[in-house]
């Protein structure tokens, strides 16, 4: 996350994360400003003249929803400034002179997680936003699955699921006869060191998806799909 430090007694730290499409969510930690100060962050594009986006802080958070034509691209970068009124005058301080959204990504969770039970295995499929489809190969998923009555802390996990929107769970990984739940989260994959800078994304895991429930299939021989394992 990006952090910007204010000066003086009201020092503050901002964290701004993007869903890598049209949204930037910011959170700040600071002593409360006086009533009616209406602070805001201003995102000024360092590339597009006149490209400014206001993020009005409500409590400790604010969200910028970019216009459709400003969907984030790898080369985007912004100057972030903090604005508030004090004694009737606008005070401005610099938060980050070069905020690179692609280095501060928290994607929306995968959607439409579904299960398809066949003899001996369960196929899980999910969807991503159409805006992220070109970056499919850069998306890494983690799956958690468990018996329905168990807590998520007891779930089994499978990670390093990269560049696909499906997964096979074999019957031997599940308890036959029990209803299971699975959920998924996503982040931008950490790529090899030789990747070009404009494809270097960093950030954190998304929130978990809505879980899907399914009946564990009966155990049979392993399924080897014609396209290989994810």
């Amino acid at each position: 996350s990006v952090t910007g430090e204010g000066q003086g007694p009201r020092s503050r730290t901002f964290t701004c994360l993007t869903n890598n499409i049209l949204r930037i969510d910011c959170h700040w930690s600071a002593p409360e400003l006086g009533q009616g100060s209406s602070p805001w962050l201003l995102f000024t594009s360092n590339q597009a003249p006149g490209g400014t986006h206001k993020c009005i802080l409500r409590g400790s958070e604010c969200t910028v929803v970019l216009p459709p034509e400003a969907v984030l691209v790898p080369s985007d970068n912004f100057t972030i400034t903090f604005h508030h009124c004090m004694s009737g005058r606008e005070q401005v301080s610099l938060v980050d002179p070069e905020y690179l959204p692609r280095r501060h990504v928290k994607l929306d969770p995968p959607s439409d997680l579904q299960s398809n039970i066949s003899s001996g295995h369960c196929i899980l499929t999910w969807s991503i936003s159409p805006a992220l489809e070109p970056m499919t190969t850069l998306l890494s998923y983690e799956l958690a699955f468990k018996k329905q009555e168990e807590a998520w802390e007891q779930a089994q996990h499978r990670d390093h699921i990269v560049g696909v929107t499906w997964l096979i769970l074999e019957a031997f990984e599940l308890d036959p006869g029990f209803i299971h739940e699975a959920r998924l989260r996503v982040q931008m994959a950490t790529l090899e060191d030789d990747v070009v800078e404009e494809e270097r994304y960093t950030g954190q895991w998304s929130e978990w998806s809505q879980p899907v429930c399914f009946q564990a299939p009966q155990r049979q021989g392993p399924l080897i799909p014609p396209w290989g394992w994810p």
Epitope: I21, L22, P68, E69, V71, L72, V73, P74, S75, S129, P130, A131, E133, P134, M135, V196, E198, E199
Partner: nanobody, 125 residues
């Protein structure tokens, strides 16, 4: 930053063919939908054709359907516009554009963040 350079324009007789190329810098080319637009003298810039990031979807203006074909080669960072059965009314400066498509359609100029300088196509009768 994606930079686009068009080539392949020129003078051709009606009924002839031309192939325009648009070379893009930067490996992020594969993330972008690509479009061709044109601007005739005294007219506004208009949509010609577009192709999705992986070439899976193509779109054409009604005026060029069946005559023009858009394609791309992500290994070469290049998008092409094959123009057949050219007409005098196809005379214009042709621009290549790149953008991440989302919510706005591929024919909308606001969809595109990066633009080339253009290449002149003149069709004589």
């Amino acid at each position: 930053q994606v930079q686009l350079v068009e080539s392949g324009g020129g003078l051709v007789q009606a009924g002839g063919s031309l192939r325009l190329s648009c070379a893009a810098s930067g490996r992020s080319f594969k993330f972008y939908g690509m479009g061709w637009f044109r601007q005739a003298p005294g007219k506004e810039r208009e949509f010609v054709a577009a192709i999705s990031y992986n070439g899976g979807s193509t779109y054409y203006a009604d005026s060029v359907k069946g005559r023009f074909t858009i394609s791309r080669d992500n290994a070469k960072n290049t998008v092409y516009l094959q123009m057949n059965s050219l007409k005098p009314e196809d005379t214009a400066v042709y621009y290549c554009a790149a953008g991440r498509w989302y919510k706005l359609g591929p024919s909308e100029q606001r969809t595109y963040r990066y633009w080339g300088q253009g290449t002149q196509v003149t069709v004589s009768s």
